[in-house]
């Protein structure tokens, strides 16, 4: 015999108190799959948590974090405080990146500057706490007579033919 509850679609529940007919989920609850015997309570986004998506009869609410915090964990179960760019969050709070490292975001850890010489390149722009170094051409490309960049042809004055 087929379970009569299997006919109940998402957004409803199989109501045992009413001969297993499909009843709509009550307010502030949802069922995301069919055949459910109960509806789940909607998540409430309170405090540091802001509503990103409202709860509907078929899907839970989704939260994100208020400015100054960012989501951690599955489904944004926690909000971790931001640091400034050029910092990382340690056991003792937000700390500046050590020399030779950078963080261009408000979260995450400080990462080492790119070592341009590993790719045979030179440093074009020095790194900072907030920005990685910018690597330029290899030192060999910068030696006299070895320019890889073709200079533009000199402009000819009107009325002069080429030599």
């Amino acid at each position: 015999l087929q379970d009569p509850c299997s006919n109940c679609p998402a957004g409803t529940f199989c109501d045992n108190n009413r001969n297993q007919i499909c009843s709509p989920c009550p307010p502030n609850s949802f069922s995301s799959a069919g055949g459910q015997r109960t509806c789940d309570i909607c998540r409430q986004c309170k405090g540091v948590f802001r509503t990103r998506k409202e709860c509907s009869s078929t899907s839970n609410a989704e939260c994100d974090c208020t400015p100054g915090f960012h989501c951690l964990g599955a489904g944004c179960s926690m909000c971790e405080q931001d640091c400034k760019q050029g910092q990382e969050l340690t056991k003792k709070g937000c700390k500046d990146c050590c020399f030779g490292t950078f963080n261009d975001q408000k979260r995450g850890i400080c990462r080492p500057w790119t070592n341009c010489s590993l790719d045979g390149k030179s440093v074009l722009v020095n790194g900072t706490k907030e920005r990685d170094v910018v690597c330029g051409p290899s030192p060999a490309d910068l030696s006299p007579g070895a320019s890889s960049v073709t200079p533009p042809a000199p402009a000819r004055e009107p009325g002069h033919s080429p030599q």
Epitope: G47, V48, F49, G68, F69, L72, S77, M78, C79, E80, Q81, L89, K91, K92, G93
Partner: nanobody
Framework: QVQLVESGGGLVQPGGSLRLSCSAS????????MSWVRQAPGKGLEWVSD????????FYEDSVKGRFTISRDNAKNTLYLQMNSLRAEDTAVYYC?????????????????WGQGTLVTVSL
């Protein structure tokens, strides 16, 4: 070991004020967000307020906004809840709770340590 001990509850008339304290020990208090949660007689737990580790960010349940103020003194390892304009519906056991990760605010389900609670009764 982590300990949270609330105090300051009592009987107060409607419109009155109380200040709850929560003394913390056994962890680096200044690194953790803290919360107040309450349980009215015969009801479930209700989140009241959060404060981040440094004390500069505070959050409140709608029903207490403008009446309650959460604060902390990291030098004294103490959390506070100043409750003004108290109403009968504020009657509850008030618990302080610690969040599980440093510099992070969690949902109530994830708080890892709770105090034993202090009873606040608002009645004539």
């Amino acid at each position: 070991q982590v300990q949270l001990v609330e105090s300051g509850g009592g009987l107060v008339q409607p419109g009155g004020s109380l200040r709850l304290s929560c003394s913390a020990s056994g962890f680096t208090f200044s690194s953790y967000a803290m919360s107040w949660v309450r349980q009215a007689p015969g009801k479930g737990l209700e989140w009241v307020s959060d404060i981040n580790s440094g004390g500069e960010s505070t959050f409140y349940e709608d029903s207490v906004k403008g009446r309650f103020t959460i604060s902390r003194d990291n030098a004294k390892n103490t959390l506070y809840l100043q409750m003004n304009s108290l109403r009968a519906e504020d009657t509850a056991v008030y618990y302080c709770a610690k969040h599980p990760l440093t510099y992070t605010i969690a949902t109530m389900n994830d708080y890892d340590y709770w105090g034993q609670g202090t009873l606040v009764t608002v009645s004539l």
